[in-house]
């Protein structure tokens, strides 16, 4: 019958090869010369070769030995024609399943597990687990079933079974009671692996189980009185460091201190952090503190871990005594910014306002005032009474010092004191439009033809703001209305000149008088250059030449 | 019938190289897997050689490994020995020979003389 | 490597006459071995494979069996063209290893 059982062939055979496996043979080979082949993964695609067959015995050939743990099954069809190629069977499934041997050693997923137990736990308490891997079959035969076993405890302290491993899952659990951090902080276990469940192939990993430490020491304060000198006004002053011990393990949270200012902070002046490697608590100031109004601050402190106590301890309190010092204060300008409205244009020595500073110091000091920042040069100054007045003409149109109406003053007030210290102040002055901005055409230049000229259409300027601007008037002067008309559209920002009689080619000059809504008058002198042409026109054509 | 014939023996010096041939008929030559073995002068038989019938692997024993290489060509139905670092004791009549049967060596040639000699 | 020890190294014989040739395997072959015979001029040709199944035009004058590790070629009645050398070969261990060859000679 042509059909064929699975083949099972065991990796790593020795050879010789060629090696036969098993002989196809069709019952239609009577009468009839019959050739065989083989196709599929291994035959005539990838892996090619590993399986051939005699083309005219039948023979199934395998070319190599085999890797289970690299093709565990190969799934080949055998054919069968007659001389004429014609198929003389269906395709024959042919399974050649490659068995295992143990060949390959269980390997630990790591060299080094690293796990953690608290102090003092029961018999029972679940480690860590370890896992090890082995290549061969564990489904059929034992070769990849592993079994764990402790093979060794390093210290052997109080006794050398503290901890077991479940043979099959590779679990590590305490078994014993007595795991004491300030006696042994750290075991060290040689582990095991087999194949063959515990029979075979044996190798060794570390497991490294940290003994934590539970929380059954609390910190304390060591002194628990300390005083303390701080210069008034000074943020993020470093007051005092507070010194704690802690028996528990350092670095962890059973060590690591939590410090709570419990009095004596009722404006909450002072913050306490913990310094990360000493574990001192750093007092500091949160904000600045006044002599003037305290010069003593008494403060209690208290001390717990990160970690909660495992058991009921007394918490350790200190006593702080801080002491202010006083410092000579900068004088502090009221308001910091002032705003002051005045016109611009005033005359020189006019008063613009009196801008003064107060000084935080108990002691009756004398204050002076100076400019430090005035960009265009326009103010003064007393030193005494901090009245400021005009040294130059202000000028709201100035670009170059003013922005948005506002010219910007930096003012400085200086005390007595030793050392004097100095406070600033920042004027800001808005400065009142007057209409001293006549309007302004633009452009200046025209060109136009003589001949059914086009309208030129010039834009009105004015610096100043309104009312001071808009609606605009427009005259002719000197005798320009003889040739030109002048008119102001109805937004009035914007005036339309003519030319309204025959100019032969040349420039002229038209002279303009725009004035604004407050009757400030401009004269302007438009250039305007009269060309030989009809309609609309850029420059003037040159002369024309006969040909 | 199945005929297989060498050639390609020669004279050669020590540490030279030689390559044989073996030019096979009367069967489907890809099919089968061929060896070389050689004879020495004293009449002992050795295997040198093995390639499986596409060519993908190829087999040798410890004496020649490294120094000779099987190769077969399924398109000139032709078998190859290239032969190098030859030594006095390499000189034999080499034979190729088919497996059938899945089994060495079915078929023989009549063989052909290898001399390494200075 | 697996050593095969053939004997007698070379037989006296009359026609008609029945012998039989031995291979010793130094180590387990199974029914892995074939027997070959060599002409004078060099002619190869094998006689019997995997222990005992016969090629096809062979003589049924020629047999083989086993016995342990010992495998035989027996020539039940020698014929005229049967006094040449003999050999084994094992194909059950690598590398392939020859026995050193029977010369069979006429009385």
């Known amino acids: 019958e042509w059909v064929m059982p699975p083949i099972f062939v065991p990796e790593n055979g020795k050879g010789p090869f060629p090696q036969r496996l098993n002989q196809l043979k069709s019952n239609k080979d009577r009468g009839t010369k019959i050739f065989y082949s083989i196709t599929g993964p291994g035959a005539d695609s990838p892996p090619e070769g590993v399986f051939a067959v005699e083309k005219e015995t039948g023979w199934l050939l395998l070319n190599k030995p085999l890797d289970r743990e690299e093709i565990a099954k190969y799934e080949l069809f055998g054919h069968a024609v007659s001389e004429n190629g014609a198929s003389v069977e269906d395709p024959m499934n042919i399974s050649i399943i490659v068995t295992d041997q143990n060949d390959h050693k269980p390997k630990f997923t790591q060299d080094t597990f690293r796990g953690s137990v608290l102090e003092g736990v029961l018999p029972g308490t679940s480690v860590m687990q370890v896992t090890a891997t082995d290549e061969d079959d564990a489904i059929y035969t034992y070769n990849g079933v592993v079994a764990y076993s402790i093979h060794s405890q390093e210290p052997k302290d109080p006794h050398d079974l503290m901890f077991t491993i479940h043979r099959s899952t590779g679990t590590i659990s305490v078994i014993s009671s007595g795991l004491d951090r300030e006696k042994v902080p750290e075991y060290t276990l040689t582990i095991q692996a087999t194949d063959m469940d515990g029979d075979g192939s044996t190798t060794t990993a570390v497991a490294v189980v940290e003994i934590l430490d539970a929380n059954d020491n609390a910190p304390m304060f060591d002194p628990q009185k300390y005083e303390a000198h701080v210069p008034e006004n000074a943020v993020g002053h470093e007051v005092q460091r507070l010194t704690v011990t802690d028996l528990d393990a350092p670095n962890s949270p059973a060590w690591r201190a939590t410090y709570l200012i419990m009095g004596g902070d009722d404006g909450d002046h002072f913050t306490i952090t913990t310094h990360p490697e000493s574990n001192q608590g750093i007092l500091t100031t949160r904000k600045g503190l006044d002599f003037e109004a305290k010069n003593q601050h008494t403060l209690y402190v208290e001390v717990t871990n990160e970690a909660p106590f495992v058991l009921k301890l007394p918490t350790s309190t200190a006593t702080i005594v801080v002491h202010v010092e006083d410092v000579n204060e900068a004088p502090v300008f009221v308001p910091p910014s002032k705003v002051v409205e005045v016109q611009e244009g005033i005359p020189t020595g006019e008063p613009v306002c009196v801008y003064t500073a107060e000084d935080p110091d108990k002691e009756n000091q004398k204050i002076s005032y100076r400019i430090l920042r005035d960009p265009a040069g326009w103010l003064a100054m007393d030193p005494d009474s901090g009245q400021v007045t005009a040294v130059g003409t202000l000028d709201r149109e100035d670009e170059q010092f003013v922005r948005n109406n506002i010219y910007e003053v930096m003012v400085l007030a200086m005390d007595n004191g030793s050392p004097p210290t100095t406070g600033t102040g920042t004027l800001l002055l808005t400065l009142i439009d007057v209409n001293d901005h006549g309007p302004v055409p633009e452009p200046r230049q025209i060109t136009i033809c003589n001949q059914s000229p086009v309208r030129q259409v010039l834009n009105i300027t004015d610096k100043d703001l309104s009312p001071h601007t808009s609606p605009f008037q427009a005259q002719l002067t000197d005798d320009s209305d003889i040739y030109w008309t002048a008119e102001v559209n109805e937004e009035g920002d914007t005036v339309v000149l003519s030319l309204k009689k025959f100019l032969k080619q040349d420039t002229y000059d038209v002279h303009l008088s725009l004035s604004d809504h407050g009757n400030k008058e401009q004269l302007t002198v438009i250039r305007a250059t009269v060309c030989d042409c009809h309609g609309h026109v850029e420059t003037c054509p040159g002369p024309w030449k006969g040909g | 019938v199945q005929l297989v014939e060498e050639s390609g023996g020669g004279l050669v010096k020590p540490g030279g190289s030689l390559k044989l041939s073996c030019a096979a008929s009367?069967?489907?030559?890809?099919?089968?897997?061929m060896s070389w073995v050689r004879q020495t002068p004293d009449k002992r038989l050795e295997w040198v050689a093995t390639?499986?019938?596409?060519?993908?692997?190829?087999y040798y024993p410890d004496s020649v490994k490294g120094r000779f290489t099987i190769s077969r060509d399924n398109a000139k139905n032709t078998l190859y020995l290239q032969m190098s670092s030859l030594k006095s004791e390499d000189t034999a009549m080499y034979y190729c020979?088919?497996?059938?049967?899945?089994?060495?060596?079915?078929?023989w040639g009549q063989g052909t003389t290898v001399t390494v000699s200075s | 490597e697996l050593v095969m020890t053939q004997s007698p190294s070379s037989l006296s014989a009359s026609l008609g006459e029945g012998v039989s040739l031995t291979c010793r395997a130094s180590?387990?072959?199974?029914?892995?071995l074939i027997w070959l015979r060599q002409e004078p001029d060099g002619t190869i040709k094998r006689l019997i494979y995997?222990?005992?199944s016969l090629d096809s035009g062979v003589p049924k004058r020629f047999s083989g069996s086993r016995s342990g590790s010992d495998y035989s070629l027996t020539i039940s009645s020698l014929e005229s063209e049967d006094f040449v050398h003999y050999y084994c070969?094992?194909?059950?261990?690598?590398?392939?290893?020859f026995g050193a060859g029977t010369k069979l000679e006429i009385k």
């Open positions: 020979a088919s497996y059938y049967y899945g089994i060495p060596f079915g078929y």
């Open positions: 009367g069967f489907t030559f890809s099919s089968y897997a």
């Open positions: 390639i499986s019938s596409g060519g993908h692997y190829t």
């Open positions: 180590q387990d072959i199974g029914i892995n």
């Open positions: 995997d222990t005992s």
């Open positions: 070969l094992q194909y059950g261990s690598s590398p392939l290893t």
